[in-house]
């Protein structure tokens, strides 16, 4: 399934275990954390990523929403339960039994309950802004030449059709690229711009998922785009139900 | 050819631990993933976890956690199973099997807990 | 959970078998597009013999009248012209995630 036969290791997964254990020793990889097997010719779905990286350390901070809707992911890591595909089961529950509703990405988007919390659906994301601030350069980026490279980036590195970047926007020295799939928009076969979005993610802080690649090497016309801070927001089909009072959605901010 | 050899049968005490063995050889250890399975008679076949030599990847099923520690040694090619705080729950043959398609298996350790 | 059915079955030589398997949960990878679904023979006083993985490979020195079928929740093991020495309990056991179970068998006994 892609995976590199040779040495037996999936191109665009680090976080697997490959072994040439399938058919007449075909190699296969499978999810660490998980053991679900992975299409290593494709990206593997943040859930079993973050199932993946469950060990890893939190990081949360707080800042202005764009949108009194919009959610980032405050909550930072956890260690996800995942359906048979390999999606985020809607509602999520830690070890002492509190439980809570995500989104398509993951994100918290109920407050927090007990077992007796119900989450009726996975509530698709289907509206994804990342904000970049860039570090200092002799002259602003040509505004085309930048949204060029950042559509091949996610063209090509991270396999995503063309026809979910609606927009990247640039007033130095922000950077906003707007990522729009609707369920109907998404076909089989296409990446999900949730998974899309967290390899981009992980590529910006200097911890590429991508096997034996070096890290994100972004440049436009040949001048390197140095990104020195990331903020996702989430936008879902169906707005998150918090009660009242509560100011402040999930964050989950990346601080490079 | 691929080869499990399993350590000899144990008889032991409630309450006390056991460790068996399980020898590969006939292919490259440290790359495929090796499992360890609980049969008792009348409860079919029950996985317990599985260890990944290449990289000390370990993964338990719940019913086992606390019960079933897997480790294993690369330089002799073999995988441990250390079961503790034995009951008569326990008795049972336990196989080490190598993962994936030609799933061999290694002839089973018998082990009766009774005091 | 992997149900299994019947629990055991008496034939006669030369007979076809259908072994049921059904698990709750799809065995379909959508991205591999691979069942994982393995079947095993055991024979009393030995260990289990891989027959068939991805519910329908058939393992290398495995008879060609043992055929693996089905696919998401349901699958079946097919023993054509049953012989004396395919007496043994057959066990279905999926590795699509942790922790990997097995059904609780099917005897096969030959009148």
């Known amino acids: 399934h892609t995976a590199a036969q040779d040495n037996c290791t999936c191109p665009t997964n680090k976080m697997t275990v490959c072994s040439p254990d399938g058919p007449g020793g075909r190699c296969q990889c499978r999810a660490l954390g998980s053991g679900v097997a992975v299409d290593c010719s494709t990206l593997t779905s943040k859930c079993l990523l973050l199932k993946a990286r469950m060990s890893a350390p939190k990081n949360a901070r707080t800042l202005v929403r764009p949108n009194e809707h919009a959610l980032v992911d405050n909550d930072g890591l956890y260690d996800p339960d995942c359906d048979p595909e390999g999606r985020f089961k809607a509602r999520q529950c830690n070890q002492t039994s509190v439980c809570w509703c995500v989104n398509s990405v993951g994100v918290r988007r109920t407050d927090k309950g007990d077992l007796s919390l119900r989450c009726d659906e996975l509530v698709r994301t289907h509206h994804i802004l990342i904000d970049l601030r860039h570090r200092p350069t002799a002259g602003a980026f040509n505004h085309s030449d930048l949204d060029a490279e950042l559509r091949r980036l996610f063209r090509e590195r991270y396999r995503l059709h063309p026809k979910f970047v609606a927009a990247v926007h640039y007033e130095q020295p922000t950077i906003q690229i707007e990522l729009r799939q609707n369920t109907s928009q998404k076909a089989a076969g296409d990446v999900d711009i949730g998974d899309a979005a967290y390899y981009f993610e992980r590529d910006v802080k200097g911890e590429s998922l991508f096997q034996g690649r070096g890290g994100l090497d972004l440049r436009v016309r040949g001048e390197p785009l140095q990104v020195e801070r990331t903020l996702i927001y989430y936008l879902d089909e169906i707005p998150p139900k918090f009660s009242m009072k509560r100011h402040h959605h999930h964050h989950h901010h990346h601080h490079h | 050819q691929v080869q499990l050899q399993q350590s000899g049968p144990e008889l032991v005490r409630p309450g006390t631990s056991v460790k068996m063995s399980c020898k590969a050889a006939?292919?490259?250890?440290?790359?495929?993933?090796i499992g360890w399975v609980k049969q008792r008679p009348g409860h079919g076949l029950e996985w317990i976890g599985n260890?990944?030599?290449?990289?000390?990847?370990?993964n338990y099923n719940e019913n086992f956690k606390g019960k079933a520690t897997l480790t294993a040694d690369t330089f002799s090619s073999t995988a441990y199973m250390q079961l503790n705080s034995l009951t008569s729950a326990d008795s049972a043959i336990y196989y080490c099997?190598?993962?994936?398609?030609?799933?061999?298996w290694g002839q089973g350790t018998t082990l009766t807990v009774s005091s | 959970v992997m149900t299994q059915s019947p629990s055991s079955l008496t034939v006669t030589a030369g007979e076809k078998v259908t072994l049921s398997c059904k698990c709750s949960q799809s065995l379909l990878n959508s991205g591999t597009q691979e069942n994982y679904l393995t079947w095993y023979q055991q024979k009393p006083g030995q260990p289990p013999k891989m027959l068939i993985y991805?519910?329908?490979i058939r393992e290398p020195g495995v008879p060609d009248r043992f055929t693996g079928s089905g696919s998401g929740t349901d699958f079946t093991l097919t023993i054509n012209n049953v012989q004396a020495e395919d007496l043994a309990v057959y066990y279905c056991q999926h590795d699509y995630s942790y922790p990997f179970t097995f059904g609780s068998g099917t005897k096969l006994e030959i009148k």
């Open positions: 099997a190598r993962e994936g398609s030609s799933g061999y």
């Open positions: 006939g292919y490259t250890f440290t790359k495929f993933w």
């Open positions: 260890i990944y030599p290449g990289g000390a990847y370990i």
């Open positions: 991805w519910a329908s």
